[in-house]
């Protein structure tokens, strides 16, 4: 019941994850112009990871997309690859994950394979999240940076008369909105890793008790099981009994904890 | 077609309060804020504020954040401009203005303050 | 505030003359978002309310005839009228659009010979 929770819970909150990195990524706010310096500007300017937009002072909002592919910085491009990565894994994730819900019975699918789906869309929520989490932060290092390069040369002008205040951006709601999801995304990765470990069987290790019949020194290891708790025998280990040497495979063995018979 | 209609003139007494309307229509109401301005004899034009149809925020010029209030019914497609405490000062020809570059504009409302 | 200032105050002109009015700003117009010049130009003539010339210091408004030519960047900016008509006396306004509080120009008063 508790895997059955954990693996449910993953998937829900791997799901609004991805979505919000979704969101994220298609949302024009990852940088919008900072105006400390200029809170009075009619003109206000706003960037994202495909177009620019202004909103001016009659409330209309104009947008223009970056029509260029190989004008563009390379850190916009890197930030672009990292969140689409993020987004496939996660779609793919996501498809897989719908197919391991151990709620939903598909054919008579083993929990072994249920368990390997898991874990497989486990691993790509948490590379999703990564991803999505490196796109924002490299995007977020790139606006501290031109923040105050800009800050350094903020004012420009002739002779001191004439002001042209030099647009400086700040952090766009789209950065949050990607830091929490990714975070999500990530969280919900690890909850599906765990879910995982509770939905593999158990290995049903038969081993083998070596039994003395009476009168004799013979053991019998029933099933053919080698009567060892090795992969193998270990003839490096000689142990000495009753003044016979014999090698570990000999020796009875007692049943441990972790066997099962 | 796209229009702005205001109000007619009006004739106050010092210290008196008026509101003017700006009925619009043929556009998209809540997608452009309603600004104002003042024309008179003595300042030419002078902006006095907007509002935002869509939520109702303002933002007003400094020196008219005493005397003007703008609010909107957005039901009506009308905004309003409540100018208070009325002085000579005040007598002017008041014009509401949207769309994009303020491309148009009410025929102006004359507000005359006299005893 | 950002202060317009316009000159002249008035140009007496004569039908098909060239005529040319500038305007200059206390600060740039410049956005640097989209690389414009949030500078409006407008004509009134009496009793009526200002007209849309010119956005974005050189763009023509639409139906405005192409006699009507505005340009210049930064702080300082000029609008002409290449061929002056009858119909053109007016008084022309320039305004930032970049920066609340928006303001006007005292205006350019355009009259006949």
């Known amino acids: 019941m508790a895997v059955t929770a954990c693996q449910g819970l993953g998937f829900v909150v791997s799901l609004i994850g991805i979505a919000g990195i979704i969101a994220a990524t298609c949302m024009d706010q990852w940088s919008t112009q900072d105006l400390y310096n200029n809170p009075v500007t009619a003109v206000f300017n706003y960037q994202g990871l495909w177009r620019s937009c202004v909103r001016e002072s009659s409330g209309f909002t104009e947008c223009r997309g970056y029509f260029t592919l190989l004008g563009l910085p390379a850190m916009l491009q890197a930030v672009r690859a990292l969140m689409i990565v993020g987004i496939v894994l996660g779609a793919i994730g996501l498809l897989v994950s719908i197919f391991a819900l151990k709620c939903i019975r598909i054919g008579s699918m083993e929990d072994s394979a249920k368990a390997n789906m898991t874990l497989t869309s486990g691993i790509m929520f948490i590379v999703s999240g990564l991803c999505a989490i490196a796109g924002v932060s490299v995007f977020a290092n790139m606006l501290v940076t031109n923040f105050w390069m800009s800050t350094a040369n903020m004012y420009t002008g002739m002779g001191g008369m004439v002001q042209t205040v030099q647009t400086r951006y700040t952090f766009g709601a789209a950065l949050f909105v990607g830091w929490v999801a990714g975070g999500l995304t990530l969280i919900g990765g690890v909850m599906m890793c765990i879910a995982c470990r509770g939905l593999a069987p158990e290995e049903t290790n038969y081993k083998a008790v070596s039994y003395h019949a009476s009168g004799h020194s013979v053991a019998y290891k029933p099933g053919g099981f080698k009567a060892s708790t090795g992969f193998g025998s270990n003839t490096k280990n000689k142990k000495i009994y009753d003044g016979g040497a014999r090698t570990e495979d000999e020796v009875q063995s007692y049943p441990s904890k972790h066997d099962y018979v | 077609e796209i229009q702005l209609q205001q109000s007619g003139p009006e004739l106050m007494k010092p210290g008196a309060s008026v509101r003017i309307s700006c009925k619009a229509s043929?556009?998209?109401?809540?997608?452009?804020?309603m600004h104002w301005m003042k024309q008179s004899h003595v300042k030419s034009l002078e902006w006095i504020g907007y509002i935002d149809p869509f939520n109702g925020n303002t933002r007003y010029n400094q020196k008219f954040k005493d005397k003007a209030t703008l609010t909107v019914d957005k039901s009506s497609t009308t905004a309003y401009m409540h100018l208070s405490s009325l002085t000579s000062e005040d007598s002017a020809v008041y014009f509401c203005a949207s769309l994009r570059f303020f491309a148009y504009w009410g025929q102006g409302t004359l507000v005359t303050v006299s005893a | 505030d950002i202060v317009m200032t316009q000159s002249p105050s008035s140009l007496t002109v004569t039908a098909g003359e060239k005529v040319t009015m500038s305007c200059n700003s206390s600060q740039s117009l410049l956005n640097s978002g989209n690389q414009k010049n949030y500078l409006t130009w407008y004509q009134q003539k009496p009793g009526q309310p200002p007209k849309l010339l010119i956005y974005?210091?050189?763009s023509r408004e639409s139906g405005v005839p192409d006699r009507f030519t505005g340009s210049g960047s930064g702080t300082d900016f000029t609008l002409t009228i290449s061929t002056v008509q009858a119909e053109d006396l007016a008084v022309y306004y320039c305004q930032n659009d970049y920066s609340f509080p928006l303001t006007f120009g005292a205006g350019t008063r355009l009259e006949l010979k």
């Open positions: 043929g556009y998209s109401f809540t997608s452009y804020y």
């Open positions: 974005w210091a050189s």
